[in-house]
């Protein structure tokens, strides 16, 4: 593939109810299980058929996974990420970012491989700021008409 | 996507040993749980062993404990099935099965529902 990719970072609260199976995903990630390069977070793998979470329809494979009920993720072993789901009660708030790619091919959620992206403000900052100026530049024309 | 390509299976008296493996591919092998499953024509897939990303878990059927042993190389992406004192009722084509990840529910390794990935399986035939 050529040139760089680059992704949007948006973040989400999701909140899901334990369904009969529970809450229907599939976790990687950790600090003795680094699923990314220099990222020991917490990914969705896997969103299990008519559980929970895929009936919801939010979480999408290859989300990083920041808190669970508002307890951080970070530095965290996989087994005890695993257990911090498992305990987590029947009404469960996730804290999620979600990564879609935004260049050099179609939009679509990471899968896995190197977290680096841009974040959303990053790009609509400068976008806001061009439309500002176009904005201005188009009024000080028609004040000269 | 996941592949799996089984090897391993063979004609065996009864009482010998055979030593399946189940090659993977995928940079996230570390990630993967891993199981065997059996299946004879006609019936039903029925659990033997799995075992967690990183070996330290595993889990037999009863029917396999104490004569069975599921292992895993996170370096080979291989896991393996160390088969002893084979039966004749041992005699059906087994299959590897994968799944990226761990579940946030309740574990349960001997549900084919658990796993994404089958290999096409390796016959074992005890005589």
């Known amino acids: 593939m050529n040139g760089r990719v680059d992704y949007l970072v948006t973040e989400e609260e999701i909140n899901l109810t334990r369904g009969p199976s529970g809450l229907g995903f599939n976790i990687v990630g950790g600090t003795d299980q680094q699923y990314v390069s220099n990222d020991s977070g917490i990914y969705v793998s896997r969103i299990k058929e008519n559980g929970a979470a895929a009936l919801d329809g939010r979480l999408q494979e290859g989300d990083k996974i920041l808190s669970v009920n508002g307890q951080d993720l970070k530095n965290l072993l996989h087994q005890d990420a695993v257990d911090l789901f498992r305990n987590a009660g029947y009404a469960v708030s996730l804290r999620v970012q979600h990564r879609l790619q935004v260049q050099n091919g179609p939009i679509g959620h990471r899968g896995e491989g190197d977290p680096s992206g841009i974040p959303i403000f990053m790009v609509l900052v400068p976008v806001f700021a061009l439309t500002m100026v176009a904005a201005w530049a188009f009024m000080r024309y028609r004040q000269q008409l | 996507d996941v592949q799996l390509v089984e090897s391993g299976g063979g004609l065996v008296q009864a009482g010998g040993s055979l030593r399946l493996s189940c090659a993977a591919s995928?940079?996230?092998?570390?990630?993967?749980?891993m199981a065997w499953f059996r299946q004879a024509p006609g019936k039903e897939r029925e659990f033997v062993a799995a075992?967690?990303?990183?070996?330290?878990?595993?889990y037999y059927a009863d029917s396999v404990k104490g004569r069975f042993t599921i292992s895993r190389d996170n370096a080979k992406n291989t896991v393996y099935l160390q088969m002893n004192s084979l039966k004749p009722e041992d005699t059906v084509v087994y299959v590897c099965?994968?799944?990226?990840?761990?579940?946030?529910?309740?574990?349960?390794?001997?549900?084919?529902?658990?796993?994404?990935?089958w290999g096409q399986g390796t016959q074992v035939t005890v005589s």
């Open positions: 099965a994968a799944v990226i990840g761990s579940t946030v529910d309740e574990y349960r390794p001997s549900d084919p529902l658990e796993y994404d990935y």
């Open positions: 995928g940079r996230t092998f570390s990630t993967y749980e």
């Open positions: 075992i967690n990303w990183s070996g330290s878990s595993t």
